[in-house]
């Protein structure tokens, strides 16, 4: 998997003529249509409600730091998080909640109730996802909060819990 | 949030040479790669099965009118709707349904059953989403229908119920 | 619905000057920003865990063969599958599972438990989706596996069960 950032951003390239002026492939490779994306899987060992992620996932034009995706190029981003829960039902219902935070503020949340029958069962699977389309500035942080993080099964389902962002439209 | 339309669409710009011919940034800013998108939150007060939306959300190259997103540029669109339900369980199961309509025709729906134990409980959360990838023409309408709209909690969860579209590929 | 592939790919076009050099629309239509996408609905009659799809859906720059989407252009793809289940509850809970496979390897799965009360009910609806962002090479296959395929309701919900991919960023 590539984990490259964007060392040679179009911003660093002189955009006028020169030897490139007639070479359309050259021209278009220098085009101001930046693309940035990330696709990270949850860290193996979770010990707090703010989720941590494996930084060896796909990172391109986005940084990862202390549980946060950090935006490097401003624009309109599509953000999506998907989590796989495995709940050993107690004798009451359980509310699973996924919060998407932008700069430590709650931007969007998803909730689902499981174990609603109130019966102690072997296990119940639940999948929960949340998406967001939002303008993000440089250094904006994107993070995920899950109160019931103990129900995120990172051992059986290490690939199922992901946070992904991609730039849809830059703000040039 | 920006709610700009596209007053200076590339269609209105002469695409031949002139003073712009050597300025690559100028050339590429006039490129025929339109982008259109919308991200609207549900209106506070719902009183019918066809959902209404807050028109002060993100709208770019898409219009909002009478519960409909109205397409302004033809192309292949990604459409996604996500709803957060809060159900005060009666003593029977409840089927929650989300319908995506294109030009008033049901194009795709999602259903989930809650309160299946038949026990009257305090409340049950359920999150439901639906997506679509489709070619849309100019003036095509996109709308959402929910039979059980009374269970959409717009007061506690005003940000959780959204309809979003974005143009993936225009039809040039 | 259009089901065109890409007969005149930019790769086959000489990208230097000529009569096109001053015509920016012409230049940009030859740009190396390939787009590939697919949106297929599940086949009417399912008889095995590997799902089959209607090949008369939307296919552009992607082939369909024997239950697989076959990638024709390398790059970073967004892959999403959504399934609508209708379960006649037995007297035990049922685990529904959706697996996304890349080259016959399980890349990501989603699970949800229904009928958890253990009561035999008339029916229970459940909607399950799964997404993936991944680099795919030419001839990579994308497929979907569902252990409980008998619960996918293709008659009542022929449009609700879909597999979709689209190229986010090519690997030029």
């Amino acid at each position: 998997q590539r984990t490259d950032s964007i060392p040679n951003s179009p911003d660093n390239i002189p955009l006028r003529g020169g030897n490139c002026s007639e070479d359309l492939l050259c021209i278009l490779k220098r085009a101001p249509f930046k693309k940035s994306w990330a696709y990270l899987q949850v860290a193996k060992h979770l010990n707090k409600t703010k989720l941590s992620w494996n930084k060896d996932g796909i990172l391109h034009g986005v940084r990862y730091q202390d549980g946060n995706l950090v935006i490097q190029f401003p624009g309109l981003y599509f953000i999506i998080c998907q989590l796989q829960f495995l709940v050993q039902c107690p004798n009451n219902s359980v509310d699973l909640k996924l919060e998407l935070l932008i700069n430590k503020h709650i931007k969007k949340q998803a909730l689902v109730t499981v174990c609603e029958s109130g019966m102690q069962t072997k296990h119940v699977y639940q999948n929960l996802s949340q998406f967001l389309l939002d303008y993000l500035q440089v250094n904006t942080t994107v993070s995920v909060n899950v109160d019931t993080f103990q129900y995120i099964d990172t051992s059986t389902f290490p690939l199922e819990n992901v946070l992904s962002v991609f730039l849809y439209s830059n703000s040039d | 949030q920006r709610t700009d339309s596209i007053p200076n669409s590339p269609d209105n710009i002469p695409l031949r040479g002139g003073n712009c011919s050597e300025d690559l940034l100028c050339i590429l800013k006039r490129a025929p790669f339109k982008k259109s998108w919308a991200y609207l939150q549900v209106a506070k007060h719902l009183n019918k099965t066809k959902l209404s939306w807050n028109k002060d959300g993100i709208l770019h190259g898409v219009r909002y009118q009478d519960g409909n997103l109205v397409i302004q540029f033809p192309g292949l669109y990604f459409i996604i709707c996500q709803l957060q339900f809060l159900v005060q369980c009666p003593n029977n199961s409840v089927d929650l349904k989300l319908e995506l309509l294109i030009n008033k025709h049901i194009k795709k729906q999602a259903l989930v059953t809650v309160c299946e134990s038949g026990m009257q409980t305090k409340h049950v959360y359920q999150n439901l989403s639906q997506f679509l990838l489709d070619y849309l023409q100019v003036n095509t309408t996109v709308s959402v229908n929910v039979d059980t709209f009374q269970y959409i909690d717009t007061s506690t969860f005003p940000l959780e119920n959204v309809l979003s579209v974005f143009l993936y590929s225009n039809s040039d | 619905q259009r089901t065109d592939s890409i007969p005149n790919s930019p790769d086959n076009i000489p990208l230097r000057g000529g009569n096109c050099s001053e015509d920016l629309l012409c230049i940009l239509k030859r740009a190396p920003f390939k787009k590939s996408w697919a949106y297929l609905q599940v086949a009417k009659h399912l008889n095995k865990t590997k799902l089959s799809w209607n090949k008369d859906g939307i296919l552009h720059g992607v082939r369909y063969q024997d239950g697989n989407l076959v990638i024709q252009f390398p790059g970073l793809y967004f892959i999403i599958c959504q399934l609508q289940f209708l379960v006649q509850c037995p007297n035990n809970s049922v685990d529904l599972k959706l697996e996304l496979l890349i080259n016959k390897h399980i890349k990501k799965q989603a699970l949800v438990t229904v009928c958890e009360s253990g009561m035999q009910t008339k029916h229970v609806y459940q909607n399950l989706s799964q997404f993936l962002l991944d680099y795919l090479q030419v001839n990579t296959t994308v497929s979907v596996n569902v252990d409980t395929f008998q619960y996918i309701d293709t008659s009542t919900f022929p449009l609700e069960n879909v597999l979709s991919v689209f190229l986010y960023s090519n690997s030029d």
């Epitope: 409600t49 703010k50 935070l101 503020h105 709650i106 899950v146 | 007061s155 | -």
Partner: antibody, heavy 124, light 110 residues
Framework: QVQLQESGPGLVKPSETLSLTCTVS????????WTWIRQPAGKGLEWIGR???????NYNPSLKSRVTMSVDTSKNQFSLKLSSVTAADTAVYYC??????????????????WGQGTTVTVSS | QSALTQPASVSGSPGQSITISCTGT?????????VSWYQQHPDKAPKLMIF???NRPSGVSNRFSGSNSGNTASLTISGLQAEDEADYYC??????????FGGGTKLTVL
């Protein structure tokens, strides 16, 4: 201007249930979280829980098994029940309003309106 | 949920600045920018002074300001005045959709 007034018995016997009501005047009860907070004499504030007009509740985990809150929008009132009380539940009980606004994100404006408090003593 | 940690007391002379700290965990103060500060005079109900870390409600003096770093929030009062003498409580929203208060700090104006 919104005002809150707590009411209920000032004395409750151990093992019984403490019941308090808060009446909201000068404004609507809709679109806010309504909160109960207590303060034992000479000690700090303790958050008990909150209820939204939709009926959604959040309770302090340490009190959750004993707390029930309800809201009556027609009377502009909300109430607190605390079961199986002991002397440790003796305190001044405040009802209060918490303002949360969902706009471009969730804005938490804190507890901006308080009742004057009512003293509840648990004793036999 | 454990109470947030505040110093039991702080003091300062009129005109000086003082800072009250409030230490929590990664599930409250460290997680959200949802920290509030309250002032309570003897035998009175508390009054909201700061919300969302550093925002003042209308009517609150701009001598009051807040900040947040890691798992610790702070309230700073500049140009200390006699009427600032009171108890101060921090409060943070938590990951379980609840609120938690600090133990309180008694401010003495010398």
């Amino acid at each position: 201007q919104v005002q809150l007034q707590e009411s209920g018995p000032g004395l409750v016997k151990p093992s019984e249930t403490l019941s308090l009501t808060c009446t909201v005047s000068g404004g609507s009860i809709s679109s806010y979280y309504w909160t109960w907070i207590r303060q034992p004499a000479g000690k700090g504030l303790e958050w008990i829980g909150r209820i939204y007009t939709s009926g959604i509740t959040n309770y302090n985990p340490s009190l959750k098994s004993r707390v029930t809150m309800s809201v009556d929008t027609s009377k502009n009132q909300f109430s607190l029940k605390l079961s199986s009380v002991t002397a440790a539940d003796t305190a001044v009980y405040y009802c209060a309003r918490e303002r949360v606004v969902g706009a471009s994100r969730y804005y938490y404006y804190g507890v901006d309106v308080w009742g004057q408090g009512t003293t509840v003593t648990v004793s036999s | 949920q454990s109470a947030l940690t505040q110093p039991a007391s702080v003091s300062g002379s009129p005109g000086q600045s003082i800072t009250i700290s409030c230490t929590g965990t990664s599930s409250d103060v460290g997680l959200y920018n949802y920290v509030s500060w309250y002032q309570q005079h003897p035998d009175k109900a508390p009054k909201l002074m700061i919300f969302e870390v550093n925002n003042r409600p209308s009517g609150v003096s701009n001598r009051f300001s807040g900040s947040n770093s890691g798992n610790t929030a702070s309230l700073t009062i500049s140009g200390l005045q006699a009427e600032d003498e009171a108890d101060y409580y921090c409060s943070s929203y938590t990951s379980s959709s609840t609120w938690v208060f600090g133990g309180g700090t008694k401010l003495t104006v010398l």
